[in-house]
């Protein structure tokens, strides 16, 4: 398991709420991709290929989430003081192998600008 | 240790039904995408059908889509064939197979399909 | 649907010596960087067994005598010292797209 800080800018905020941006690299076929909160799984995506190379993307713990081709963006809406804290990404590579996972994240500093509906 | 183990086989009419179990164990069955393959005595491997972790995808052989049916049930850890229109031609060992992300790295051993009258 | 044919239908090799199998699919399996073609070794009375993937990479467990090479349409299966307990036929298979298909087997034997 490797651990890091991300090399990216893992927060982009827009409207009260945040994008969480977790990548991986272009080569990786199919992986299982969590969004950790401290150690809480907040949201998962995983994406598998059968024998006919179709794609099946799956999430347990559901968020609103986009998939790119190296890149997993989870959507944190209605932020609060409450969301500040350390977020990871915990990616679990499947395909190429041989079965690897890496962990990288950052802390999500909450200021009253980009919180919602705040009170004038 | 990966098991597979399938069941179900035997003699059957033209025309008739049948339906295959495969009992897996030693792994997270519903993380895999499960598969069947057929062989005919003294022939090679065909494909016959696939379906994704959860059961909600499933493709199949153009020999036999409209006919066979498969399925899943991730609580029992078990993978199903339903045969129906059953040929002649459908007389073969069909084999359980995990799709292992990118090959098939177990198999069972088999169940013996025979279709005649 | 992509066709896969192998060559030779069989082949008699001396312990020891080389087996070389030939695999060639109707369209090209490369796809970024990976080529998705499969070997299986079927030994009789048994089922199939993973030998290679990704054209070239050995499973666990199998023997470094097997390797696999190869790239677009044109794949080889090369078993570099032949052994007994390799007796068995060899399929070819892709995953490109559905359906997955394999070749039809080439047998090897003892001469």
């Known amino acids: 398991e490797i651990n890091g800080s991300a090399n990216y800018e893992m927060f982009i905020f827009h409207n009260g709420g945040v994008q969480i941006l977790c990548k991986y690299p272009d080569i990786v076929q199919q992986f299982k991709m969590q969004l950790l909160k401290g150690g809480q799984i907040l949201c998962d995506l995983t994406k598998t290929k059968g024998s006919g190379n179709t794609v099946s993307i799956k999430s347990l713990k559901f968020c609103h989430s986009q998939l790119s081709n190296n890149s997993v963006s989870f959507f944190l809406y209605n932020l609060d003081h409450s969301h500040a804290n350390y977020y990871f990404c915990n990616l679990s590579i499947f395909d190429p192998p041989p079965f690897k996972v890496t962990l990288t994240g950052g802390y999500l500093h909450i200021y009253e600008s980009q919180l919602c509906c705040q009170l004038k | 240790e990966v098991q597979l183990v399938e069941s179900g086989g035997g003699l059957v009419q033209p025309g008739g039904s049948l339906r295959l179990s495969c009992a897996a164990s030693?792994?997270?069955?519903?993380?895999?995408?499960m598969d069947w393959v057929r062989q005919a005595p003294g022939k090679g491997l065909v494909w016959v059908s696939n379906?994704?972790?959860?059961?909600?995808?499933?493709e199949y052989s153009p020999f036999v889509k409209g006919r066979f049916t498969i399925s899943r049930d991730n609580a029992k850890n078990t993978l199903y064939l339903q045969m129906n229109s059953l040929r002649a031609e459908d007389t073969a060992v069909y084999y359980c197979?995990?799709?292992?992300?990118?090959?098939?790295?177990?198999w069972g051993q088999g169940t013996l399909v025979t279709v005649s009258s | 649907d992509i066709v896969m044919t192998q060559s030779p239908d069989s082949l008699a090799v001396s312990l020891g010596e080389r087996a070389t199998i030939n695999c060639k699919s109707s369209?090209?399996?490369?796809?970024?960087?990976?080529?998705?073609l499969t070997w299986y070794q079927q030994k009789p009375g048994q089922p199939p067994k993973l030998l290679i993937f990704?054209?070239?990479t050995r499973h666990t467990g199998v023997p470094d005598r097997f390797s696999g090479s190869g790239s677009g349409t044109d794949f080889t299966l090369t078993i570099s010292s032949l052994q007994a307990e390799d007796v068995a036929v060899y399929y070819c298979?892709?995953?490109?797209?559905?359906?997955?298909?394999f070749g039809p087997g080439t047998k090897v034997d003892i001469k």
């Open positions: 990704y054209a070239s």
């Open positions: 369209q090209s399996l490369l796809s970024g960087s990976f080529n998705y």
């Open positions: 298979h892709h995953h490109y797209n559905a359906p997955p298909t």
């Open positions: 379906i994704d972790e959860s059961g909600s995808i499933a």
């Open positions: 030693g792994f997270t069955f519903s993380d895999y995408w």
């Open positions: 197979s995990r799709w292992g992300r990118f090959a098939f790295d177990s």
